[in-house]
């Protein structure tokens, strides 16, 4: 009864020419050990002489017999459980069946493994994760279906040629199962990395190289987005125009909505990749970004800080301090909003200029009475002169003086 | 046969430009990465740049950064290494390099000394 | 930080053995290396490139008296019966790519006597 020849080993096993193959095998026979076997390229069976006919890659029988000129061919096994067979160089015409044939004391069972013998060294494959996201780690996997004791190979990752080494784990797996040999690498991958190509290299042991294979990444990201003004320097006067401009470099998927922000908060109605300002006031001053989404989420642009420069603003007078007791000192500070700020201040005292007062402060070490009254000041940049605000009462305190008798 | 020829070494001033250049030949220029690596007077090598085998990216060690600029032309196989406001502590052969997955081809170097 | 450290020089008697350090900062013990050599007014050429176990490969033209080794965050070029011609400097070099900054690090070199 032949169903008691239970068999586990690869359907297929993949080498190139000149390198080796190595066939993990398992085997059940219940009736007993292993009398005989044999190993054929291709067999066919010949019904004439009920037995198979095919090239005799190795055989082994009670008398110990080994085909001479077979010595690359090597059978590893045992009587009882293990088929392991090693090919040491394998060749292109040993492409096609391998047959197993087995024969106990009572039965006989013809397994079948296939072997696919390329010219040249095949490429490893690249797997790739379904989406790959800009700085969300990924493991990209290059997977070879050989592995072979007498032929060390390595997997080498390359992107755009450059080395991508130490974050890669090579493993193999020479199995019943499965034979391969893979390559596992983490990579963090950023915007720039978009478009570019991955390679794994198949080198022998020496480092030679064998064979390859390439991906071109897909890296999903935000929108990468530059902005431009006019003027360059941002700096303009109150009633010029400025022209904002949003440019995407880079965004995948594709961008679906454009926003305009100042200070944070978005400018309603600007839904353009232009910003056009136009008789700009003193209050559009700020920072500048362009926000454009895509399916990722938003990219923003660095901020352009507007400048938009006016006269001074009507001055108004703080006083350090008032009432001030004769003999103390004060100090009087012009605060006018300007841009750019005021370089010189005219300092009025009851109506009348100051001179020599040409500072944002003005300070008097020693108050006398003569001293109090209303202070006022004018302050000025390139763009112009402010007007005079309403200014400031200086209340002197002082003892009696030139007391009277009445 | 793989080859590298450096040229454009020279004395120059700190604070002043050069252009050092490689030529390759023997292999396609194309599919490697390339790099300069420069050897200081004290006999100690430095990696100073690479650029990806089809120049969309450039990598630069932290001393050259922003002063120098690594470029090729793969139509006429050629590297250049554009190194501005120069310093005495540049002072070094420069050395032309095939990056695979190290660096398994050399030039015969191209000596930059910096002095006042 | 990526560092290699290499003694700075080595005597060894003719034909005894030679085992030369290189050991990786300690975050980074696990990093495959490669081995140079240079004799003087040299470019460097590859010796060797040894992996976080131990397996290696040795470049083009380069005597089966090279072999390497690792343990933990040492990597090591072994020299049997070291001979006249092995006399020159031996530096380790190692690569990184970090996010999208590829670097490279060389050791200080070790120069290599060989007495008698």
């Known amino acids: 009864d032949s169903s008691k020849w239970v068999f586990e080993h690869p359907e297929t096993l993949y080498a190139w020419e000149g390198a080796c193959v190595w066939i993990p095998c398992t085997y059940r026979a219940l009736d007993g050990d292993l009398e005989s076997f044999i190993l054929f390229h291709n067999p066919e069976y010949n019904k004439n002489t009920s037995k198979f006919d095919g090239t005799r890659l190795y055989e082994s029988t009670k008398d110990g017999k080994v085909p001479s000129e077979q010595k690359r061919v090597q059978f590893l096994g045992d009587k009882n459980k293990n088929c392991t067979l090693s090919i040491h160089p394998v060749h292109l015409n040993d492409s096609g069946q391998l047959g197993l044939r087995m024969e106990s004391k009572t039965e006989k069972w013809m397994e079948r493994i296939h072997l696919n013998v390329s010219e040249r060294p095949f490429p490893p494959h690249i797997q790739l994760p379904p989406e790959i996201q800009e700085s969300q780690e990924v493991t990209l996997t290059c997977l070879l279906n050989f592995s072979c004791y007498g032929y060390p190979i390595q997997l080498q990752w390359l992107l755009e040629g450059v080395p991508m080494r130490q974050a890669a784990v090579t493993s193999t797996s020479l199995t019943i199962k499965s034979v391969f040999t893979r390559s596992e690498l983490k990579f963090s991958p950023q915007w720039s990395h978009h478009g570019k190509i991955v390679t794994c290299q198949l080198q022998d042991a020496d480092g030679k190289f064998l064979s390859n294979d390439t991906v071109q990444l897909n890296v999903k990201h935000t929108p990468k987005l530059e902005i431009k003004v006019t003027p360059s320097d941002a700096i303009v006067r109150e009633g010029d125009s400025v022209t904002m401009t949003c440019e995407v470099s880079s965004s995948n998927p594709e961008y679906t909505t454009v926003s305009w922000l100042k200070d944070g908060t978005s400018l309603k109605k600007q839904n353009t990749f232009t910003l056009n300002l136009r008789e700009v006031t003193k209050d559009q001053s700020g920072k500048y970004c362009c926000q454009v989404s895509n399916d990722v989420g938003p990219g923003r642009s660095e901020e352009v800080f507007l400048q938009v420069q006016y006269a001074p603003e009507p001055s108004t007078v703080q006083i350090l301090h008032s009432p001030a007791v004769e003999g103390s000192q004060v100090e009087f500070l012009c605060m006018s909003l300007a841009n750019p700020l005021p370089t010189n201040y005219t300092w009025y005292h009851n109506g009348k200029e100051m001179q020599g007062r040409t500072e944002e402060k003005v300070h008097i070490p020693k108050i006398l009475p003569w001293h109090a009254g209303t202070y006022s000041c004018v302050a000025e940049n390139i763009l112009g002169t402010g007007q005079r605000g309403p200014g400031a009462e200086l209340d002197v305190q002082y003892p009696p003086k030139k007391v009277t008798t009445v | 046969e793989v080859q590298l020829v450096e040229s454009g070494g020279d004395l120059v001033k700190p604070g002043e430009s050069l252009k050092l250049s490689c030529e390759a030949s023997?292999?396609?220029?194309?599919?490697?990465?390339m790099s300069w690596v420069r050897q200081t007077p004290d006999r100690r090598l430095e990696w100073v740049a690479t650029?990806?085998?089809?120049?969309?990216?450039?990598y630069y060690s932290d001393s050259v950064k922003g002063r120098f600029t690594i470029s090729r032309d793969n139509v006429k196989s050629t590297l250049h290494l554009q190194m501005n406001n120069l310093k005495s502590g540049d002072t070094a052969i420069y050395f032309c390099?095939?990056?695979?997955?190290?660096?398994?081809?050399w030039g015969q170097g191209t000596t930059l000394t910096v002095s006042s | 930080q990526l560092v290699l450290t290499q003694s700075s020089s080595a005597s060894f008697s003719l034909g005894a053995s030679a085992k030369l350090t290189c050991t990786l900062s300690?975050?980074?013990?696990?990093?495959?290396i490669e081995w140079y050599q240079q004799q003087p007014h040299k470019p460097p050429k590859f010796v060797m490139e040894?992996?976080?176990?131990?397996?290696?490969y040795t470049g083009d033209g380069i005597p089966d008296r090279f072999s390497g080794s690792s343990s933990g965050a040492d990597r090591y070029l072994s020299i049997s019966n070291i001979q006249p011609e092995d006399e020159t400097i031996y530096i380790c070099g190692v690569s990184d790519m970090i996010k999208d900054q590829f670097v490279y690090v060389f050791g200080g070199g070790t120069k290599v006597t060989v007495l008698g």
């Open positions: 023997g292999f396609t220029f194309s599919n490697y990465a």
């Open positions: 040894i992996k976080k176990d131990g397996s290696h």
């Open positions: 300690s975050q980074h013990s696990t990093y495959t």
């Open positions: 650029i990806s085998s089809i120049g969309s990216f450039t």
């Open positions: 390099a095939r990056l695979g997955v190290y660096f398994d081809s």
